[in-house]
C-alpha cells in the first residue's frame, strides 16, 4: 500500500514509546567517595532502574539524542556543621560531553542549612531538589555533585536520588 | 492489508497518548485528618484533575502499568513549633501494593524548618518538594504523608499538592 | 484502504511527538525588572530553548492545548535581609488567560530564608523549586513571580530557571 517504510517506523516508534528513555538511581553507602568526584548511584536494586539510558561511574549516559527532564534530590543533615565549611552547600547537575574538556553546569542550588538547627539543638535536616529540561546528544553524560558531600545523608535510597526521562 | 491488528493498536495508542495518564490533586481543608492516615486531596475542583488515574482515600491509583513521574509539594509553616516535635519534619511519597502488607517508602525528605524564624519573629515558612520516577502496576497506589501534619498550611490548593504522569 | 485520514494523523503525530512541546528558560541579568512585573528569561542562549512553545514578556505561551508539567527554580540569597521585608518570600507560577482579568495562582511556595544565616555570618542561601501539571489552552500564558525579587540571585542561568513540557 506504499506505506511500508513509514509503517515500520510507526511500529518501531510504538515500541520505543513504551521504552521512552527513563531512569531513577538511588543513593547507597557507596555513593559518597570522598574523592572529589561525582556521587555514585545504585542502578538495579530496590527502586533503581535504567530504561534506555546507560550508567557509568556516577553518570547517566544518553543513548538517544533529545530533550530530557533530569532531576536529583539530596538529603542533607548533620549535628552542627564542619569547621571550615562555608555557609553554602552546592548541589548541582553537570553535563560531560566530548565537545568540552570541562563539565558544564546545568542546574545548581546553593543552600545554607547549617543555620537551621532549632534552639538548643544542633541537629538540622534539609533537602535540595533540582529538576529541569536539558538537551543530551548520544554519549553525553549527566552527573550529580554536592559540595560539601560530607553533609549528604544516605539511608535507603529514598532520600537522595537521581533520574531522568525523555520529554 | 494484514495490518489490521497492529493498526487498531496504533489507533488506540494515538488516543491513549492524548490520554497519557496524568493527575494533579490539590490541598483542601479536608486534607488534614489528624488520624495518622495519609493526606487527602481535592480531585475535581479548581486546578485538580484525574486523567487515566484513579483516586481513593488519599491515594493515586494506577490503571495502567508503567513508569510514572510522581511529585508532591507541601507548604509548611507556623509560629514556633509544638513541643515534642523532633527537629525533623518528614514528607514522603509511599506505595501501597497488594504484594506487601506495609507501605513502601518511595521518595522522602526530612527538614528542620522550625529553626528558621527570623530574629524576633517566630513565624516561619518552608516548602518541601519531592519528585521522581517509580514503577506502578495496575492497582498499586501512591500516598503522601507528612509528620507532623499539623505544620502543613492549606489555603487554596496552590501551596500543597500531589500529582503524577506516565513517562 | 480507508485508513488514509487516520494514517496522515499518525504520521503527523509521530513527527509532533518528536516535537512534543518543551521549553527551558534561564535567568539572566535582565530577569529582575524591579517593575512589579514577572521575572524575564533568556530563551535562546546557553541552555535555554523553546520547542513548540512561545515566549512573550516573561511568559511561556502555549501553542497547543493540553496538560503541561511546568516548573521553576529560583536561587535566593543575601547578607541579612532588607528592613521591612516580611519574614516570607513568595515564589509562584501564575496563569494569564483571556478568560479572566487577573492572573491565576497555579503553584506557589512561601519560605523564610532570612533566618537561615549560620552563626557569626549573616550570609544565607536558599532555593525554591516548584513543579506540577496544569492545563493550558492555546494562547494561555504562564509567568514566574518572586516577592521580594531583590533576594533572587542570578549568575549563569543554572540557579534560576523556568520550563515546561507537555505530558
Amino acid at each position: 500500500d506504499g506505506h511500508g517504510g513509514s509503517w515500520e517506523q510507526l511500529i518501531q516508534e510504538r515500541r520505543s514509546h513504551q521504552n521512552n528513555p527513563a531512569a531513577h538511581l538511588t543513593g547507597a553507602n557507596s555513593s559518597l567517595t570522598g574523592s572529589g568526584g561525582p556521587l555514585l548511584w545504585e542502578t538495579q536494586l530496590g527502586l533503581a532502574f535504567l530504561r534506555g539510558l546507560d550508567y557509568h561511574d556516577g553518570a547517566l549516559v544518553a543513548n538517544k539524542a533529545g530533550y530530557y527532564y533530569i532531576y536529583s534530590k539530596v538529603q542533607l543533615g548533620g549535628v552542627g556543621c564542619p569547621l571550615g565549611l562555608a555557609s553554602t552547600i552546592t548541589h548541582g547537575l553537570y553535563k560531560r560531553t566530548p565537545r568540552y574538556p570541562e563539565e558544564l553546569e546545568l542546574l545548581v542550588s546553593q543552600q545554607s542549612p547549617c543555620g537551621r538547627a532549632t534552639s538548643n539543638s544542633r541537629v538540622w535536616w534539609d533537602s535540595s531538589f533540582l529538576g529541569g529540561v536539558v538537551h543530551l546528544e548520544v554519549g553525553e553524560e549527566v552527573v550529580v555533585r554536592v559540595l560539601d558531600e560530607r553533609l549528604v545523608r544516605l539511608r535507603d535510597g529514598t532520600r537522595s536520588y537521581f533520574g531522568a526521562f525523555m520529554v | 492489508d494484514g495490518h489490521g491488528g497492529s493498526w487498531e493498536q496504533l489507533i488506540q495508542e494515538r488516543r491513549s497518548h492524548q490520554n497519557n495518564p496524568a493527575a494533579h490533586l490539590t490541598g483542601a481543608n479536608s486534607s488534614l485528618t489528624g488520624s495518622g492516615g495519609p493526606l487527602l486531596w481535592e480531585t475535581q475542583l479548581g486546578l485538580a484533575f484525574l486523567r487515566g488515574l484513579d483516586y481513593h482515600d488519599g491515594a493515586l491509583v494506577a490503571n495502567k502499568a508503567g513508569y510514572y513521574y510522581i511529585y508532591s509539594k507541601v507548604q509548611l509553616g507556623g509560629v514556633g513549633c509544638p513541643l515534642g516535635l523532633a527537629s525533623t519534619i518528614t514528607h514522603g511519597l509511599y506505595k501501597r501494593t497488594p504484594r506487601y502488607p506495609e507501605e513502601l517508602e518511595l521518595l522522602v525528605s526530612q527538614q528542620s524548618p522550625c529553626g528558621r524564624a527570623t530574629s524576633n519573629s517566630r513565624v516561619w515558612w518552608d516548602s518541601s518538594f519531592l519528585g521522581g520516577v517509580v514503577h506502578l502496576e495496575v492497582g498499586e497506589e501512591v500516598v503522601v504523608r507528612v509528620l507532623d501534619e499539623r505544620l502543613v498550611r492549606l489555603r487554596d490548593g496552590t501551596r500543597s499538592y500531589f500529582g503524577a504522569f506516565m513517562v | 484502504d480507508g485508513h488514509g485520514g487516520s494514517w496522515e494523523q499518525l504520521i503527523q503525530e509521530r513527527r509532533s511527538h518528536q516535537n512534543n512541546p518543551a521549553a527551558h528558560l534561564t535567568g539572566a541579568n535582565s530577569s529582575l525588572t524591579g517593575s512589579g512585573g514577572p521575572l524575564l528569561w533568556e530563551t535562546q542562549l546557553g541552555l535555554a530553548f523553546l520547542r513548540g512553545l512561545d515566549y512573550h514578556d516573561g511568559a511561556l505561551v502555549a501553542n497547543k492545548a493540553g496538560y503541561y508539567y511546568i516548573y521553576s527554580k529560583v536561587q535566593l540569597g543575601g547578607v541579612g535581609c532588607p528592613l521591612g521585608l516580611a519574614s516570607t518570600i513568595t515564589h509562584g507560577l501564575y496563569k494569564r488567560t483571556p478568560r479572566y482579568p487577573e492572573e491565576l495562582e497555579l503553584l506557589v511556595s512561601q519560605q523564610s530564608p532570612c533566618g537561615r544565616a549560620t552563626s557569626n555570618s549573616r550570609v544565607w542561601w536558599d532555593s525554591s523549586f516548584l513543579g506540577g501539571v496544569v492545563h493550558l489552552e492555546v494562547g494561555e500564558e504562564v509567568v514566574v513571580r518572586v516577592l521580594d525579587e531583590r533576594l533572587v540571585r542570578l549568575r549563569d542561568g543554572t540557579r534560576s530557571y523556568f520550563g515546561a513540557f507537555m505530558v
Partner: antibody, heavy 119, light 111 residues
Framework: EVQLQQSGAELVKPGASVKLSCKAS????????MYWVKQRPGQGLEWIGE????????IFNEKFKTKATLTVDKSSSTAYMQLSSLTSEDSAVYYC????????????WGAGTSVTVSS | DIVLTQSPASLAVSLGQRATISCKAS??????????MNWYQQKPGQPPKLLIY???NLDSGIPARFSASGSGTDFTLNIHPVEEEDAATYYC?????????FGGGTKLEIK
C-alpha cells in the same frame, strides 16, 4: 487537676540573688513550655521568657536576658527562675504559666511569688 | 516590639449591660489567617486567667457571655450581659513576635 505551685514570698537585699520555683502537677511536664511573667505593684504584665522542659532551651525578652536564668528539673516537674543583682526595680510578683503551640496562650498560671527588694 | 494599646483604661458598666474593650496592635498579629491575640482576666490578688485565645476562641470553662473578635491590628473583647463577678482588669496579649507583650489593661467596674 492541673496546677502550678509556686514558692513563697521572698524579702531580699539589693545586689543579692533569689531562686523561685514552680512545681507542675496534673499534666505531663514535658509537653508544655513554661513561661515567667512579671507584675510590678499596680502595674501591667511583662513577659520575661520561656523554657522548653524537654531540652532546657530558653528564649528571653531582651530586657531580662542578664537578669533572669531559667532552668528545669524534669525529675520533679519543677521550673526555676533565678533573678540576680536585685534592685528595687525587681520588686514584683512573678508568675509562672504554662502554654503551648499553636497559639502560645498561657492557659494555667501559678498563684505568683512576691519578691521584695529592700535593705 | 509590638505595642498593644488598650482602651478605655477603665470603664463602668451597669449589671446586665455590654462591656466592650478595644486592643490595637502596632503591627499585624496575623499569620496565615490565624490571629495571635489572647485575652486574660485578672482579679485583685489573683493570677491572670485565660479567657480567649487566637482572637476569638473561648477557653474551656469560660462562660459564653465572653466573646471576642478582630483581625490584623484591631481586636475587641465583649462581655454581655455583664455580671458582678466580671469586675476585674482585662489584658490583651500578642504571641506572634518576641518579646510577647501585654496591653496596659482595662479596669472594669460594675455599676
Amino acid at each position: 487537676e492541673v496546677q502550678l505551685q509556686q514558692s513563697g514570698a521572698e524579702l531580699v537585699k539589693p545586689g543579692a540573688s533569689v531562686k523561685l520555683s514552680c512545681k507542675a502537677s496534673g499534666y505531663t511536664f514535658a509537653t508544655y513550655y513554661m513561661y515567667w511573667v512579671k507584675q510590678r505593684p499596680g502595674q501591667g504584665l511583662e513577659w520575661i521568657g520561656e523554657i522548653n522542659p524537654t531540652n532546657g532551651g530558653t528564649i528571653f525578652n531582651e530586657k531580662f536576658k542578664t537578669k533572669a536564668t531559667l532552668t528545669v528539673d524534669k525529675s520533679s516537674s519543677t521550673a526555676y527562675m533565678q533573678l540576680s543583682s536585685l534592685t528595687s526595680e525587681d520588686s514584683a510578683v512573678y508568675y509562672c504559666a504554662r502554654g503551648n503551640w499553636p497559639y502560645w496562650s498561657f492557659d494555667v498560671w501559678g498563684a505568683g511569688t512576691s519578691v521584695t527588694v529592700s535593705s | 516590639d509590638i505595642v498593644l494599646t488598650q482602651s478605655p483604661a477603665s470603664l463602668a458598666v451597669s449589671l446586665g449591660q455590654r462591656a466592650t474593650i478595644s486592643c490595637k496592635a502596632s503591627q499585624s498579629v496575623d499569620f496565615d489567617g490565624d490571629n495571635y491575640m489572647n485575652w486574660y482576666q485578672q482579679k485583685p490578688g489573683q493570677p491572670p486567667k485565660l479567657l480567649i485565645y487566637a482572637a476569638s476562641n473561648l477557653d474551656s470553662g469560660i462562660p459564653a457571655r465572653f466573646s471576642a473578635s478582630g483581625s490584623g491590628t484591631d481586636f475587641t473583647l465583649n462581655i454581655h450581659p455583664v455580671e458582678e463577678e466580671d469586675a476585674a482588669t482585662y489584658y490583651c496579649q500578642q504571641s506572634i513576635e518576641d518579646p510577647w507583650t501585654f496591653g496596659g489593661g482595662t479596669k472594669l467596674e460594675i455599676k
